[in-house]
């Protein structure tokens, strides 16, 4: 029978670490991490790490009992957890019978938004207590709410990941810019900022009709040439405060009728929000 892995939590040092080993298996040949989605009961879904590793193809694989994987996450708080994956059989060959290196994976470490993870793995038995053993590590940075997978998470939806304000902005005259956008029931307060290398105008927008989507309009006084300037719309939602997803548009000349026309180049930008 071919070896498989059985993984379980192991927070402390492995018991083998306390023992003296004359020989130890070699290091891992490769370690990779990618996010995968799994459905959860609440109708939301969770993002987990798929950690996969490749074993070195030589006879030292015969000593291999387990591989330990530890993950440290750094965002606004630090997390640390480890799993030990035991091999169910001794290795009878250095490569898979069908060809290629022995490759295994573990899916289970949860992934939070905008977090840097340090994933380390080493084979067991590992080096003796005062020796450096062979190990391998990789970094993985989880994406934020603008990611095509993450944006559908409830946390992100509440932060406006699916909201498209459809910003239009036009220069009415040398002193003013008219900004129009679609509001969202997620919040009722917004800030519109006009930038042309520096901030040339801004305005707070308060939209009392929070429960339905409406088209808001605001005329903003500017202190410089506004044509081609960037409009940045920052919403203030309860879940993310002043660090919600920001949206951008570009100021064009207003048509003669005074009605601003829609833009093609609306862009979104996360405001550095760490949920």
């Amino acid at each position: 029978r071919e070896p498989t892995v059985q993984c379980g939590s192991e927070t402390g040092p492995s018991p083998e670490w306390m023992l003296q080993h004359d020989l130890i298996p070699g290091d891992l040949r490769d370690l990779r991490v990618e996010p995968v989605t799994t459905s959860v009961a609440t109708g939301d879904y969770s993002i987990l790490m798929n950690v996969s590793w490749v074993l070195r193809a030589d006879a030292s694989i015969r000593l291999l009992k387990a591989t330990k994987i530890c993950v440290t996450g750094k965002s606004n708080f630090q997390s640390y957890s480890c799993v030990r994956c035991n091999y169910t059989e001794a290795f009878q060959t250095q490569t898979r019978p069908s060809g290629g290196k022995w490759t295994f994976s573990y899916i289970g470490f949860p992934v939070e938004l905008n977090t840097v993870y340090f994933i380390g793995a080493h084979n067991i038995p590992n080096a003796n207590m005062n020796e450096d053993g062979p190990s391998m590590s990789v970094n993985f940075t989880s994406p934020g709410c603008l990611d095509h997978i993450m944006k559908y998470k409830k946390k992100c939806v509440k932060a406006g990941s699916l909201w498209d304000p459809n910003i239009t902005a036009c220069k009415k005259n040398e002193e003013t810019v008219e900004v129009n956008f679609t509001t969202t029931p997620l919040g009722n307060r917004y800030m519109a900022l006009i930038q042309h290398s520096t901030i040339i105008g801004f305005s707070q927008v308060f939209e009392p009709h929070q429960k339905k989507q409406t088209r808001a309009s605001v005329v903003i006084p500017v202190t410089g040439d506004s044509e081609g300037a960037t409009v940045q719309l920052t919403p203030y939602f309860p879940t993310c405060g002043s660090d919600c997803i920001r949206h951008k548009g570009t100021v064009v000349l207003c048509p003669q009728t005074g009605v601003p026309f829609p833009l093609d180049n609306n862009k979104s930008k996360p405001g550095g929000w760490l949920p």
């Epitope: 004359d22 020989l23 070699g26 193809a57 030589d58 006879a59 030292s60 015969r62 000593l63 009878q92 060959t93 250095q94 490569t95 898979r96 019978p97 069908s98 060809g99 290629g100 290196k101």
Partner: antibody
Framework: EVQLVQSGAEVKKPGASVKVSCKTS????????MNWVRQAPGQGLEWIGR????????QYNQKFKDKAILTVDTSISTAYMELSRLRSDDTAVYYC???????????WGQGTLVTVSS | DIQMTQSPASLSVSVGETVTITCRAS??????LAWYQQKKGKSPQLLVY???NLADGVPSRFSGSGSGTQYSLKINSLQSEDFGSYYC?????????FGGGTNLEIK
Amino acid sequence: EVQLVQSGAEVKKPGASVKVSCKTSGYTFISYWMNWVRQAPGQGLEWIGRIDPYDSEIQYNQKFKDKAILTVDTSISTAYMELSRLRSDDTAVYYCARSGGFDWFAYWGQGTLVTVSS
Amino acid sequence: DIQMTQSPASLSVSVGETVTITCRASENINSNLAWYQQKKGKSPQLLVYDVTNLADGVPSRFSGSGSGTQYSLKINSLQSEDFGSYYCQHFWRPPYTFGGGTNLEIK
């Protein structure tokens, strides 16, 4: 029946290169590492390196790192070893040898004599 | 790199005798050892792998033993076809190395 058939003897001048082939049959080529071993006249055996035909991972004996290049063509189940900047002390019989479950050499080619002479 | 020291370098014996060839590794190779026989002008042939396992078609008069750093190959009741060179090889971790060889000749 597992067979490893190597290309014929070669005579080369110093500084030249030579490419030795090892055509395999009778087993799944990508399932076993292929090793190359050298035996100078009247001398013992020296491991040159090995290649995994599955993904072309190569491991060399440091001594031969700048001398030998190992490649495979999985479409024709053939391994190759190219020797460059030949010198007279590269004169030897070169063998391909297929690994077993681990790196004991279960099957050997018939050997290719490479003679380097001016 | 692991050095393999083989002894004796040559041996002159008669048919029917028993011989033992030894191989010492410079460090523990955890029983990852093979023995080969090579006849003049021919390719080496696997005799024994994993210290004690005989390769297909190898007569039972050949036997291997040892562990750690010390290994040996024993040939009982030598036959005429057993004469030639014998090599040990470790396959613990690359780079793999062979012993210097033992030349077995007829007395």
